[in-house]
């Protein structure tokens, strides 16, 4: 056909190289995203299904954009928001799935998204009837005001020395040893 590199046959920024044999006067080396003997065809990059987990692929020209289905995130929708396997909860916390997201259920004394924040177990004022709360490595301890007892100072101590403990479980009389 007589076309040479001097005629500028390569489109879309393709690099023209003179052909090595008489049958091809030139060869176009195409930039990413283009193909064809003259780099005239745009490669359908979305046809390669680059977006994971059923994400919608948009070819912006200069880049791709993935729009993710519910429950997935990331540039390629590669992160499963419901997947506890990809979630590390620190300080003995456990991962809980559901609701399109996953969260950490933190061990006593810890809080925050990944259980990395130290929580004050006394912040909720757990000690009743004016008891004083002390944070302890294993949780909290209540120092009860006079006249109260129990782990949370919830039971009043009667003047005769008896305490108003909760009723005995069914089948047990007060005073019976609990098995």
């Amino acid at each position: 056909s007589g076309v040479t590199c001097a005629d500028g046959p390569c489109f879309n920024g393709g690099l023209c190289v003179g052909g090595a044999d008489p049958d091809s006067a030139y060869i176009c080396h195409c930039p990413p995203g283009f193909q064809g003997s003259n780099c005239e065809k745009r490669v359908d990059r979305c046809s390669l299904q680059p977006c994971r987990n059923g994400g919608l692929c948009l070819d912006l020209g200069h880049a791709l954009r993935c729009r993710c289905r519910a429950g997935f995130a990331g540039p390629r929708c590669e992160h499963d928001l419901d997947d506890c396997a990809g979630r590390a909860c620190a300080n003995g916390g456990t991962c809980v799935e559901g609701g399109g997201a996953h969260r950490c259920s933190c061990a006593l004394g810890f809080g925050g998204r990944d259980c990395r924040e130290r929580a004050d177990p006394c912040a909720a004022r757990p000690c009743a009837h004016g008891g004083r709360c002390y944070a302890h490595f294993s949780g909290l301890v209540c120092a009860c005001a006079p006249g109260y007892m129990g782990a949370r100072c919830e039971f009043p101590v009667h003047p005769d020395g008896a305490s108003a403990l909760p009723a005995a479980p069914p089948g047990l009389r007060p005073g019976d040893p609990q098995r």
Partner: antibody
Framework: QEQLVESGGGLVQPGASLTLTCKAS????????MCWVRQAPGKGPEWIAC???????AYSASWAKGRFTVSKTSSTAVTLQVTGLTAADTATYFC??????????????????????WGPGTLVTVSS | DIVMTQTPASVEAAVGGTVTIKCQAS??????LAWYQQKPGQPPKLLMH???VLTSGVPSRFSGSGYGTEFTLTISDLECADAATYYC??????????????FGGGTEVVVK
């Protein structure tokens, strides 16, 4: 530490032109788009334009085409040229980074669709 | 181009309370929504992207939900430091081949 700093703002006459500069430090300019967003007093942010650093591709809001031109001037700086300024262009102009992500063997970079780093802004006041 | 509509324009709540901000997109944007916090004299700060993914360092009191066209930002256990204006934002790609970004009108959060 990652930082963007805008400069070039000030008081300008209606009809004048202006060039704003955004300098980046503390991060690799590549695999990011550098964008311009403006905010008129008491209003919400309004996206103007971006330039993708890897190949220089620029894209802008339809209303900004013609009067606003974004360019990459060095490996750490981008500019926004504005012509035909009017009082309606009075705003704080922010430079913002929109990250792109690359994966080995992937056919392209992937746009994130958000802005994860902003400069403090430069105020442009158009008044006679 | 896409239009992002935020409600309410302003909301007031007490310290320790909860605030809910809604953002509606004029078309299906899947999960492509970001939330920003802006205080006077400062640039917007990214709180969340992909509708529900918190940015590093943002407290878990902030949470996001929604998909398609309806999205919500919830701030629980309100603190005085949460007093700010909050914006939603998405990106769009039109059939004409133009790519860009759109912001909501903003919601001012007043903490009593």
């Amino acid at each position: 530490q990652e930082q963007l700093v805008e400069s070039g703002g000030g008081l300008v006459q209606p009809g004048a032109s202006l060039t704003l500069t955004c300098k980046a430090s503390g991060f690799d300019f590549t695999s990011n788009a550098m964008c311009w967003v403006r905010q008129a007093p008491g209003k919400g942010p309004e996206w103007i334009a971006c330039i993708y650093n890897d190949d220089g591709s620029a894209y802008s809001a339809s209303w900004a085409k013609g009067r606003f031109t974004v360019s990459k001037t060095s490996s750490t700086a981008v500019t926004l040229q504005v012509t035909g300024l009017t009082a309606a262009d009075t705003a704080t102009y922010f430079c913002a980074r929109s990250p792109y992500y690359t994966y080995g063997g992937a056919p392209s970079a992937y746009a994130s669709g958000y802005f994860n780093l902003w400069g403090p802004g430069t105020l442009v006041t158009v008044s006679s | 181009d896409i239009v992002m509509t935020q409600t309410p324009a302003s909301v007031e709540a007490a310290v320790g309370g909860t605030v809910t901000i809604k953002c509606q997109a004029s078309e299906n944007i899947y999960n492509s929504l970001a939330w920003y916090q802006q205080k006077p004299g400062q640039p917007p700060k990214l709180l969340m992207h992909d509708a529900s993914v918190l940015t590093s360092g943002v407290p878990s009191r902030f949470s996001g939900s929604g998909y398609g066209t309806e999205f919500t930002l919830t701030i629980s256990d309100l603190e005085c430091a949460d007093a700010a204006t909050y914006y939603c934002q998405s990106d769009y790609y039109s059939t004409g081949g133009s790519y860009g970004f759109a912001f909501g009108g903003g919601t001012e959060v007043v903490v009593k």
